[in-house]
Amino acid sequence: LIIGFGISGRHSITVTTVASAGNIGEDGILSCTFEPDIKLSDIVIQWLKEGVLGLVHEFKEGKDELSEQDEMFRGRTAVFADQVIVGNASLRLKNVQLTDAGTYKCYIITSKGKGNANLEYKTGAFSMPEVNVDYNASSETLRCEAPRWFPQPTVVWASQVDQGANFSEVSNTSFELNSENVTMKVVSVLYNVTINNTYSCMIENDIAKATGDIKVTESEIKRRSHLQLLNSKAS
């Protein structure tokens, strides 16, 4: 969390951002809140990016003002217009690109003053893994697949019964480049699994960590997966 204050002769207002990550090809949100004004006419929101000449986005006097917008963001940005009045300056970024990563500044002017805060935005690819029993294999084998990751992640297997065990000798992980030549499909196979046990396939890079669990018993198979973005720090 980054909290910024204004530094002009005018009063300062509090602006708060949260570091976040964008998933390539999907829409992302750059989060920013500020001390709200009671009227829309005096609110100005400017989003800037370090190293970029033009503005990322500008909203003033109740509408988007995009004449100074940088070409790389053309047609890809929007604020939540109905929430500006209650202090939400967050920016929706459409079709996140790898090159969108960097340091952004959320700069706010209201009738009460000015303020700004920086935000670190990481980009990459991350997806939920799915773990299945591989019935084609000669021995009991689990197959963990996740369709889109970048940068290349690490894959670690764990088991509830054999806590702390190292499965690197009995697992094999491959990375297959997807058609857009950036993201990769992750496939990891775990051999010699035992029933009545819960296995976890953990995929992690510097942006996200995802886990796929599978519980194999004689009567049923239960699956669960979750994904967590790393380094979501507020500012």
Epitope: E35, P36, D37, I38, K39, L40, S41, E61, G62, K63, A81, D82, I85, V86, K112
Partner: antibody, heavy 115, light 107 residues
Framework: QVQLQQPGSVLVRPGASVKLSCKAS?????NSWMNWAKLRPGQGLEW???????????EYNEKFKGKATLTVDTSSSTAYMDLTSLTSEDSAVYYC????????WGQGTLVTVSA | DIVMTQSHKFMSTSVGDRVSITCKAS??????VAWYQQKPGQSPKLLIS???YRYTGVPDRFTGSGSGTDFTFIISSVQAEDLAVYYC?????????FGAGTKLELK
């Protein structure tokens, strides 16, 4: 859930003052404006003013300056409005409403000014 | 001060009808207009903010449109529970101002 509790009614003498309360719960009181509005039968709604508890910023409708004074007690998440030198023109229902969108309204306090 | 004019004080309707309530601002308020519903004996309730954004939990038969000075609030198919007074309001500049209200009643 969000709640704004206001007393149902109050009877006051002409020339007197009254302090109306609005107790908030279910959200972070300090982070939203609290607005006050007046409704008289056949007159429509009028905005009196708003206060931002976190900073103490206050905005008044010029028409109500000198008539209404807005304050807050952040420790009890309560907003107050003082009305002074009351006349029959001040007889109305007074509402408190959360944030700049007036997204949630209290039930209103009926103020009757009568001798 | 910005004056918000609701041209109809009363509107008669039947259940299932499409109803359109208009509101005109005396100067440009961009899209900073909200619509509220007030039923008898109740406090007002936010339906639409920033011209066209339905507030949480508001049925999709309620819609809003417009920009600048002319705004419209539509109920696509009136239900019995929609009989109420509807107010427009601008939050573009202070003082914040409301329309006089349009009372929706049964024919």
């Amino acid at each position: 859930q969000v709640q704004l509790q206001q007393p149902g009614s109050v009877l006051v003498r002409p020339g007197a003052s009254v302090k109306l309360s609005c107790k908030a719960s279910g959200y972070t009181f300090t982070n939203s404006w609290m607005n006050w509005a007046k409704l008289r039968p056949g007159q429509g709604l009028e905005w009196i003013g708003g206060i931002y508890p976190n900073s103490g910023n206050i905005e008044y409708n010029e028409k109500f300056k000198g008539k209404a004074t807005l304050t807050v007690d952040t420790s009890s998440s309560t907003a107050y409005m003082d009305l002074t030198s009351l006349t029959s023109e001040d007889s109305a229902v007074y509402y408190c409403a959360r944030d700049s969108r007036f997204s949630y309204w209290g039930q209103g306090t009926l103020v009757t000014v009568s001798a | 001060d910005i004056v918000m004019t609701q041209s109809h004080k009363f509107m008669s309707t039947s259940v299932g009808d499409r109803v359109s309530i208009t509101c005109k601002a005396s100067q440009d308020v961009r899209t900073a207009v909200a619509w509220y519903q007030q039923k008898p004996g109740q406090s007002p309730k936010l339906l639409i903010s920033s011209t066209s954004y339905r507030y949480t939990g508001v049925p999709d038969r309620f819609t809003g449109s417009g920009s600048g000075t002319d705004f419209t609030f539509i109920i696509s198919s009136v239900q019995a529970e929609d009989l109420a007074v509807y107010y427009c309001q601008q939050h573009y500049s202070t003082p914040l101002t409301f329309g006089a209200g349009t009372k929706l009643e049964l024919k």
